[in-house]
Interface confidence: low
């Protein structure tokens, strides 16, 4: 009979670009923990094996750090990291215990385009200043026809550039594991989420490179 329970950090939120620690704790069982898997949807992030120690998926190696303890630290968060994370404790003789954590990665307030967060006063002041400066420049420029044409051309270029960026920066965050372009994947969509390469969805393994960090510390409380 499985008597153990997994306590997790539950639903947590963090800011884009920041870090977060995912923590699970198995208690109320004397079962021996043989391995802990950390998964994001069906993507394996890391393994902490009693014999081998830590394995980190190389496609996440730049953004995932083992620990503290059996936890996992996610760094350089992107909105694509929003979603469910699971800690899976393989134990003997009990079997498998699974804990769930929901992570929401919030846009940093200045970068937020939607109306979900209020722009702080400094941001508002800066935006106003930019608008005023732009208006003054445009008015001055309009008095000179040649320069006006040049400015018009530059604005057109800027519009085209920003349209191209928006193509790869959807305002709605992609769910974790949604990055399925294996070819010609733009860095903004795949590079940030998968590390160096954008692997196909069913390729769960993504090579686990062994980190010589010593054995995992498997402790359970019987209380």
């Amino acid at each position: 009979m499985m008597t153990g329970t997994i306590e997790t950090t539950g639903n947590i939120s963090a800011e884009k670009g920041g870090s977060i620690i995912l923590q699970c704790h198995l208690s109320s069982t004397t079962a021996q923990v043989t391995q802990v898997n950390w998964e994001q949807q069906d993507q394996l992030l890391a393994i902490c094996n009693a014999d081998l120690g830590w394995h980190i998926s190389p496609s996440f190696k730049d953004r995932v750090a083992p620990g503290p303890g059996l936890g996992l630290t996610l760094q350089s968060l992107t909105v694509n990291d929003t979603g469910e994370y699971f800690c899976i404790y393989h134990t003997y003789p009990d079997g498998t215990y699974t804990g769930r954590i929901f992570l929401e990665v919030l846009e940093s307030s200045v970068a937020e385009h939607g109306a979900r967060f209020q722009i702080p006063l400094l941001g508002a002041m800066a935006a106003t200043l930019v608008v005023i400066c732009t208006a003054v420049i445009v008015v001055v420029a309009l008095t000179r026809k040649k320069k006006a044409l040049r400015i018009h051309s530059v604005e057109g270029d800027l519009r085209r550039k920003s349209a191209g960026q928006e193509e790869w920066s959807p305002s709605a965050p992609s769910p974790p594991g949604s990055c399925v372009q294996a070819e010609a994947a733009p860095a903004g969509l795949c590079g940030e989420q998968r590390g160096e390469d954008c692997a196909e969805l069913h390729d769960y393994f993504n090579v686990l490179s062994y980190r010589s960090l010593g054995n995992c510390s498997f402790f359970t409380e019987t209380g």
């Epitope: 394995h55 393989h90 079997g95 196909e200 769960y204 090579v207 490179s209």
Partner: antibody, heavy 115, light 109 residues
């Protein structure tokens, strides 16, 4: 279509080394792992290790650490497995396979170690 | 070490019959990481089923997979002559990270 083409059969003397190649085509080479599997009549299928060509990260079965070395050449979409200090028990068919699900396999390379 | 035990070692059946192949893990594994392969003499193994129950591309639907925890099954609902081969189960996530069962030989009765 996806293909993994392995180098031909090898006959080696004990103590020698052998380097088996696996050339991938038909998919984005840097987006999938390539695994190596040993097959012998006595031991069945044994996983040797795997390499992720995207960043050349490797992972080995402890049993084959020091025996097998995996490398990859992105420019030619080829993965290599070198077996060192060959012994008679290394005589086997060696396969490369793509991804964790091993959805595509090479045709196999027979390595015979004999004095 | 996670050991996969396949049974029976040899299964003798006739075309048209139903085949049930078992794969038991020495400790619980995630169903996401249990796959089945078919191998014919002189050929490479071929992926049949991945993630316990998903049919690989081009595999006929007479093949099906099921299971969870430590017990997994491959079923061939109605045997065709080309189905006689050796079948292997494989797991990922244990130690070693990938292990195979010893195989079940499906032979003509």
């Amino acid at each position: 279509q996806v293909q993994l083409v392995q180098s031909g059969a090898e006959v080696k003397k004990p103590g020698a080394s052998v380097k088996v190649s696996c050339k991938a085509s038909g998919y984005t080479f840097t987006s999938y792992n390539v695994h190596w599997v040993k097959q012998t009549p006595g031991q069945g299928l044994e996983w040797i290790g795997t390499i992720y060509p995207g960043n050349l990260a490797t992972s080995y079965n402890q049993k084959f650490k020091g025996k097998a070395t995996l490398t990859a050449d992105k420019s030619t979409s080829t993965v290599y497995m070198e077996l060192s200090s060959l012994r008679s028990e290394d005589t086997a068919v060696y396969y490369c396979a793509r991804s964790g699900t091993m959805d595509y396999w090479g045709q196999g390379t027979t390595v015979t170690v004999s004095s | 070490e996670i050991v996969l035990t396949q049974s029976p070692g040899t299964l003798s059946l006739s075309p048209g019959e139903r085949a049930t192949l078992s794969c038991r893990a020495s400790s619980s594994i995630s169903s996401t990481y249990l796959h089945w392969y078919q191998q014919k003499p002189g050929a490479s193994p071929k992926l049949l089923i991945y993630n316990t129950q998903n049919l690989a591309s081009g595999i006929p639907d007479r093949f099906s997979g099921s299971g969870s925890g430590t017990s997994y099954t491959l079923t061939i609902s109605r045997l065709e002559p080309e189905d006689f081969a050796v079948y292997y189960c494989q797991q990922f996530g244990g130690y070693p990270l990938i292990t195979f069962g010893a195989g079940t030989k499906l032979e003509l009765k």
